[in-house]
Interface confidence: medium
């Protein structure tokens, strides 16, 4: 009998009430793998959530957040308020990044500017609330008579903290 159920494909369930016939999942339900004895209820994207992908008989719906909010958690389980670039979200709302820190996204926290001197480089472009500093050649490389054959190092990609 188990073998009969294992023949039921995704999008169906093994119906014990009907001699283990493979029955299609009812509306608003799905089975993503074969051999299922029940179909799972589709997720409903309501309230702060909007539908990114409709539920089908073989896959669950996928939700996104409404405008002004972004997803947090596995499978967009929560929506969090956006801020502008150059800000971070605190309990009291969106606050500007402190001097020496930046945020180039609408989410996440303000992060410290790159310390160019740690890599023996100098600041080529100053940082802002929205952008990291751009590091250039080391001060020694810029001294008179120094070889200019070596191109300046590319700006370091700022590390992104986990969201």
């Amino acid at each position: 009998l188990q073998d009969l159920c294992s023949n039921c494909p995704a999008g169906t369930f093994c119906d014990n009430n009907r001699s283990q016939i493979c029955s299609p999942c009812p509306p608003n339900s799905f089975s993503s793998a074969g051999g299922q004895r029940t179909c799972d209820i589709c997720r409903q994207c309501k309230g702060v959530f909007k539908t990114r992908k409709e539920c089908s008989s073989t896959s669950n719906a996928e939700c996104d957040c409404i405008s002004g909010y972004h997803c947090l958690g596995a499978e967009c389980s929560m929506c969090e308020q956006d801020c502008k670039q150059g800000q971070e979200l605190t309990k009291k709302g969106c606050k500007d990044c402190c001097f020496g820190t930046f945020n180039d996204q609408k989410r996440g926290i303000c992060r410290p500017w790159t310390n160019c001197s740690l890599d023996g480089k100098s600041v080529l472009v100053n940082g802002t609330k929205e952008r990291d500093v751009v590091c250039g050649p080391s001060p020694a490389d810029l001294s008179p008579g120094a070889s200019s054959a070596t191109p300046p190092a590319p700006a370091r990609e700022p590390g992104h903290s986990p969201q």
Epitope: G68, C79, Q81, G93
Partner: antibody, heavy 122, light 107 residues
Framework: EVQLVQSGAEVKKPGASVKVSCKVS????????MHWVRQSPGKGLEWMGS????????IYAQKFQGRITMTEDTSADTAYMELSSLRSEDTAVYYC???????????????WGQGTLVTVSS | DIQMTQSPSSLSASVGDRVTITCRAS??????LNWYQQKPGKAPKLLIY???SLQSGVPSRFSGSGSGTDFTLTISSLQPEDFATYYC?????????FGQGTKVEIK
Amino acid sequence: EVQLVQSGAEVKKPGASVKVSCKVSGYTLTELSMHWVRQSPGKGLEWMGSFYPEDGETIYAQKFQGRITMTEDTSADTAYMELSSLRSEDTAVYYCATEGVGVIRGNWFDPWGQGTLVTVSS
Amino acid sequence: DIQMTQSPSSLSASVGDRVTITCRASQSISSYLNWYQQKPGKAPKLLIYAASSLQSGVPSRFSGSGSGTDFTLTISSLQPEDFATYYCQQSYSTPPTFGQGTKVEIK
């Protein structure tokens, strides 16, 4: 579906304290941000404070600092708001409200409790 | 704190009328604006959140629009059960603040 049921009406003397309860059903209290809003007779709505479960932080309105305490009994899925040093102008309907499941700092309020009338009179 | 100003403070209308209530914020609040309906002796009920999103179960005759500082709640065809007081509320920053309310009365 979240439902909030508040404790009954209270009459208090000036200088006393009042503690209003808000029982959550349909979800556990730890899943919800809890907010308290009051409405004085014939007046508008005034936010008093919020509790955020992600890190257990509570924020109070400046106006009530030092007089308000919001607490939670998670085992009973009940939130409490205590207001001390009551004066006549604290006579109001006090509401608890959540901001909807899945919302972090959305700060819109739904659903609301039915309200608790607190009368401060000598 | 961000100040919210509603207009008018009250209005008289008839069943079937199109009603518009406006709300102005003292600074830009993007789309973080919510609308509530309150009937006497009852708790407020959320109608619209994030300026234009209709709360589940709220009739489609209610709609919200606006961004920045100016927002509008529109009832396309006023029904008997819509006579109530309406409040706007900003959720851009703490403290969340409410407008003073607009009472919609029967003409």
